[in-house]
């Protein structure tokens, strides 16, 4: 799965920044806007009475540059540098008239078929659970196996370093082929199969990856927003997993929601399955001590734990994964389209 080159993006922020650097006015405005904030977080209107005139003017001068509307890609090289530029420029779009954050990631739909070889699975017992089978599929793939071992190593042991573990998790879900990553994490289990459920819940090594004491969810979001990558992943998730109705219709495609969900794993906002017996997911945080922001905190928490779009997307992907092993495929090697599960 080659990393997308900048040229494959319609308007990469890295390209746009280079173009801006060649223009003294644009370059100076970009630097000035960058100095208008010491952290990545955009204050909410309630926190700041107004934006200083110089920042507004610098933003105004950037509004007709190619930087406005530039985007990044989740698998591109120099992704963090691209996201840094995106969020600096985002201030130019939102200063003065606060706008909700927009995902920095350009949608690129791939129709490249991923080949999976099921023939080697016959070494497993026929009644092995599907999580075991998907784990084996990963093991049989050199890249998936290498990446999984890397995070397994980083996330194991009594003295694991959480930040190293998270970095390796992030790398896995970024670089492993999507069907492998999704198969590993979103494998279906029989309702009474606690062993399978336990295996699924432990996929992301929660003992190391998740905080030992659940922090406040709003504090967790604040921490996330101070990092351009985490902020980007969270905004991407909120963009694509936004439920349109209680039936689980997503704002965009279910597959896009799942990609965004998996993109959070390895960030400060790493979600996980809450138990061995169902497919409910949640953030590892609490809304205790939120004071007058209790409602806002519960909305954030609920975006994970009570989100019909996400719930239905996970359920649909698990149904799809079940079908892979229940059908009589004509050949041991079959192709799974990456966009198979879009609605």
């Amino acid at each position: 799965d080659p990393l997308p080159t900048e040229s494959r993006l319609m308007n990469s922020c890295l390209q746009a920044r280079r173009k801006c650097q060649a223009d003294p006015t644009c370059s100076a405005a970009y630097h000035h806007l960058d100095s208008c904030t010491s952290s990545i977080s955009t204050p909410l209107p309630s926190e700041e009475p107004s934006v200083p005139a110089d920042c507004l003017e610098a933003a105004q001068q950037l509004r007709n540059s190619s930087l406005i509307g530039c985007m990044c890609h989740r698998r591109m090289k120099n992704q963090v540098a691209c996201l840094d530029i995106y969020w600096t420029v985002h201030r130019a779009r939102s200063l003065g008239n606060y706008e909700l954050d927009v995902s920095p990631y350009e949608d690129t739909v791939t129709s490249k078929p991923w080949k999976m070889n099921l023939s080697k699975l016959n070494m497993l017992k026929p009644d092995s659970d599907l999580c075991l089978k998907f784990a084996m599929l990963c093991t049989l793939n050199d890249k998936c196996d290498r990446l999984r071992k890397a995070y397994g190593e980083a996330c194991s042991g009594p003295h694991c370093q959480r930040h190293v573990c998270l970095r390796q998790l992030l790398t896995f879900f970024e670089k492993a082929a999507e069907p492998h990553a999704q198969g590993l994490l979103l494998c279906p289990c029989a309702p009474n199969d606690r062993g399978c459920g336990e295996r699924r819940r432990n996929t992301i090594a929660p003992n190391c990856a998740l905080p030992p004491v659940a922090p406040n969810c709003l504090e967790l979001r604040r921490l996330c927003f101070s990092d351009p990558l985490c902020r980007s992943r969270l905004v991407d998730f909120q963009t694509h997993c936004h439920p349109m109705d209680i039936l689980g219709t997503c704002a965009t495609e279910q597959s896009r929601c799942l990609r965004a969900y998996l993109g959070l794993i390895g960030t400060a906002m790493t979600p996980n399955f809450v138990s061995n017996v169902n497919t409910s997911v949640a953030l590892s945080c609490t809304c205790r001590g939120s004071g007058n922001l209790q409602e806002e905190c519960e909305m954030l928490e609920g975006f994970f734990s009570h989100n019909p779009c996400l719930t239905e997307a996970i359920a649909a992907k698990m149904r799809f994964h079940s079908q892979l092993f229940s059908q009589d495929w004509p050949h041991p090697t079959f192709a799974v389209m990456a966009h198979q599960n879009e609605n």
Epitope: C36, S38, S41, E48, A53, E57, A58, Q61
Partner: antibody, heavy 120, light 113 residues
Framework: EVQLLESGGGLVQSGGSLRLSCAAS????????MSWVRQAPGKGLEWVSF????????YYADSVKGRFTISRDNSKNTLYLQMNSLRVEDTAVFYC?????????????WGQGTLVTVSS | DIVMTQSPDSLAVSLGERATINCKSS????????????LTWYQQKPGQPPKLLIY???TRESGVPDRFSGSGSGTDFTLTISSLQAEDVAVYYC?????????FGLGTKVEIK
């Protein structure tokens, strides 16, 4: 060395017009915002108008809005202030001032000023 | 508009003594996102244009003697001349540049006692 030299001031009757100029040298004129600031005799400083380096953004004090127009000619390194419908209370020394950046912050260089006197 | 209030109106200080000028803004000029105070101080001697002394509330302009210092945050600011010299006789103005229009205080006249 940065230099700003105002000209165009003088005595004018109420309701009349004047055009002030400010010749700039010693810096990349088109990269910096410029402002006009005035000072009535024996009084404090009052900001009048702002223009960005490209001329794309202009702002005015409420007291002069609709009567004064700020402009610049970057090829001539010159800042202008066209003043129409002048009033007695516009009597002041008018300074052109260079912005430290290009965004309307503080003024790091000032001209010597040109006196505008509006008589009734 | 942000109103800038300077005190005192005038100040007589002996040579070598400390002079302190206060400036208060009607609303905060501290921008929490970059932790900068949008306040500057100018010195104006008779018959001359203003000269920049201090910006961002406490950063001294190059070439300005280190006896001049600025302090304060939010709405309350101070310009201090640690040891007054004869050439410091002038009117001192504070200015906010947080919002348009930028506004000046009415000035504080510093004289020698």
């Amino acid at each position: 060395e940065v230099q700003l030299l105002e000209s165009g001031g003088g005595l004018v009757q109420s309701g009349g017009s004047l055009r002030l100029s400010c010749a700039a040298s010693g810096f990349s004129f088109n990269n910096y915002a410029m402002s006009w600031v005035r000072q009535a005799p024996g009084k404090g400083l009052e900001w009048v108008s702002f223009i960005s380096g490209s001329g794309g953004s202009t702002y005015y004090a409420d007291s002069v809005k609709g009567r004064f127009t700020i402009s610049r000619d970057n090829s001539k390194n010159t800042l202008y202030l066209q003043m129409n419908s002048l009033r007695v209370e516009d009597t002041a020394v008018f300074y052109c001032a260079k912005d430290r950046y290009n965004y309307g912050t503080f003024f790091d260089y000032w001209g010597q000023g040109t006196l505008v006197t509006v008589s009734s | 508009d942000i109103v800038m209030t300077q005190s005192p109106d005038s100040l007589a200080v002996s040579l070598g003594e400390r002079a302190t000028i206060n400036c208060k803004s009607s609303q905060s000029v501290l921008y929490s996102s970059n932790n900068k105070n949008y306040l500057t101080w100018y010195q104006q001697k008779p018959g001359q244009p203003p000269k920049l002394l201090i910006y961002w509330a406490s950063t001294r302009e190059s070439g300005v003697p280190d006896r001049f210092s600025g302090s304060g945050s939010g709405t309350d600011f101070t310009l201090t001349i640690s040891s007054l010299q004869a050439e410091d006789v002038a009117v001192y103005y504070c200015q906010q540049y947080y919002s348009t229009p930028p506004t000046f205080g009415l000035g504080t006249k510093v004289e020698i006692k």
